[in-house]
């Protein structure tokens, strides 16, 4: 007796996190064996869509010309080869961008900083969000969201970080976002640029660059140290 | 600051297999797309392929059947193998990566030196 | 497959000269198109993404606009630095695509 089928890879291109009305493209990949390819959505009626392989028959696309509110979610996908279904695939979450308007980013007392001193950096919406996240250029998730405890409303989280050192300077984007769907996002704040000056640790980076380290920065969450924020939200380190 | 370096045989017979690996230090591979990209003496850049960082890989229609592309993610490694090579398939080749999410792009922004490989009995 | 076609495939400009290369694709790519300059003898590197999106670090006399199918490069004053292959890249689903690419030399 053969074991499951293999569980087929799923990704999105050109990536998981799209604006509003721009093409995303789902693609599905198994084996050469694959007859018919299927993508299930979370929450909608399965199968969500079906596709047959492409040749060599190893993957399928699932396009979407146009990002709304409808495609954000998470999807999973299989394959049916001769000898029955695949396992499903690990998830994929797929967001969009711009479901609001953008908050603003700023930083407190500024934005040029003396290292080992501490700044706060504050994204601020027009309408009350309860989630907020903060993203760093050059970082591959959010560095954090600030999520509120009960689902209260918010106009605004803080980012505190302190002491800060070199490998805070950088550019910052903010987004907010309603608790009931965290796979729709703000459109991003206007981008923020941090200067770190006078830093002790020797020849600062461009502020635009992670600091390297063995550990791979640039794929890590960059945490600002400090108290929780007064605002009553809740961190969720990411 | 990420680096990316191609390593392999600068010579290569015609009929026979070009492998190339790519090694990425200053960062971990696991994140999002690296490519092959090759040009050819004088002329433009030719995009062959990517791996994203979980193994789903694309590859250009035109050289589908003789590429394959995969990734290492212990060494920190992508390499690039194309089969029954020929004359035409001399060129500089660059191994490339695009790392972030959020703003979820193709676009290469690290690039290799490139290394040539010279198809030739 | 969506094709890329540059315009023009050479031009001869002078110092302080506005120049303005663009890029056709065959089908709509949304805004995911990327520009890179590639000097002779010399790795590419990337200008522009996101169709307007300047890379940190570029200069800003460089400047990208179009979506769709219709793209532009702009260097509102060229620099004796600026001589280089330019290439456009679409990057909205596999294949990949790069166009021909437009050389740009100095008068």
């Known amino acids: 007796q053969a074991g499951p089928l293999p569980k087929p890879t799923l990704w999105a291109e050109p990536g998981s996190v799209i604006s509003w009305g721009n093409s995303v493209t789902i693609w599905c990949q198994g084996t050469l064996e694959a007859r018919e390819y299927r993508l299930d959505k979370e929450e909608s009626p399965a199968p969500w869509d079906r596709q047959n392989p492409l040749e060599p028959k190893n993957k399928a696309r699932f396009s979407i010309p146009s990002m709304t509110e409808d495609y954000a979610g998470r999807y999973r996908c299989y394959y049916r080869s001769p000898v029955g279904w695949s396992q499903p695939s690990d998830p994929l979450e797929l967001v969009m961008t711009g479901a609001y308007s953008k908050p603003t980013l700023s930083a407190l007392p500024s934005p040029l900083v003396t290292s080992g001193k501490s700044v706060t950096l504050l994204c601020q919406s027009r309408s009350p969000m309860d989630t907020f996240l903060l993203i760093k250029e050059r970082a591959a998730h959010p560095l954090l969201h600030l999520r509120s405890e009960h689902g209260a409303q918010q106009h605004q989280a803080e980012f505190p970080m302190s002491p800060v050192t070199s490998v805070h300077g950088g550019t910052y984007r903010c987004f907010s976002s309603h608790g009931f769907s965290h796979y729709l996002l703000s459109h991003p704040s206007d981008p923020l640029e941090l200067i770190v000056s006078g830093s002790l640790e020797g020849p600062r980076p461009s502020p635009t660059r992670s600091v390297s380290t063995a550990a791979g920065p640039e794929d890590q969450p960059l945490m600002p140290t400090g108290s929780v924020p007064h605002s009553g939200l809740r961190r969720h380190w990411e | 600051q990420v680096q990316l370096q191609e390593s392999g045989p600068g010579l290569v017979k015609p009929s026979e297999t070009l492998s190339l690996t790519c090694t990425v230090s200053g960062g971990s591979i696991s994140s999002h797309y690296w490519s092959w990209i090759r040009q050819p003496p004088g002329k433009g850049l030719e995009w062959i392929g990517y791996i994203y960082y979980n193994g789903g890989t694309n590859y250009k229609p035109s050289l589908k059947s003789r590429v394959t592309i995969s990734v290492d993610t212990s060494k920190n490694q992508f390499s690039l193998k194309l089969t029954s090579v020929t004359a035409a398939d001399t060129a500089v080749y660059y191994c490339?990566?695009?790392?972030?999410?959020?703003?979820?792009?193709?676009?290469?922004?690290?690039w290799g030196q490139g290394t040539l490989v010279t198809v030739s009995s | 497959d969506i094709q890329m076609t540059q315009s023009p495939s050479s031009l001869s400009a002078s110092v302080g000269d506005r120049v303005t290369i663009t890029c056709r694709a065959s089908q709509g790519i949304s805004n995911y198109l990327a520009w890179y300059q590639q000097k002779p003898g010399k790795v590419p590197k990337l200008l522009i993404y996101?169709?307007?999106t300047l890379q940190s670090g570029v200069p800003s006399r460089f400047s990208g606009s179009g979506s769709g199918t219709d793209f532009t490069l702009t260097i509102s004053s060229l620099q004796p630095e600026d001589v280089a292959t330019y290439y456009c890249q679409k990057y909205n689903s596999a294949p990949w695509t790069f166009g021909q690419g437009t050389k740009l030399e100095i008068k």
């Open positions: 996101a169709a307007s």
């Open positions: 490339a990566g695009r790392r972030y999410y959020y703003d979820s792009s193709g676009y290469l922004d690290y």
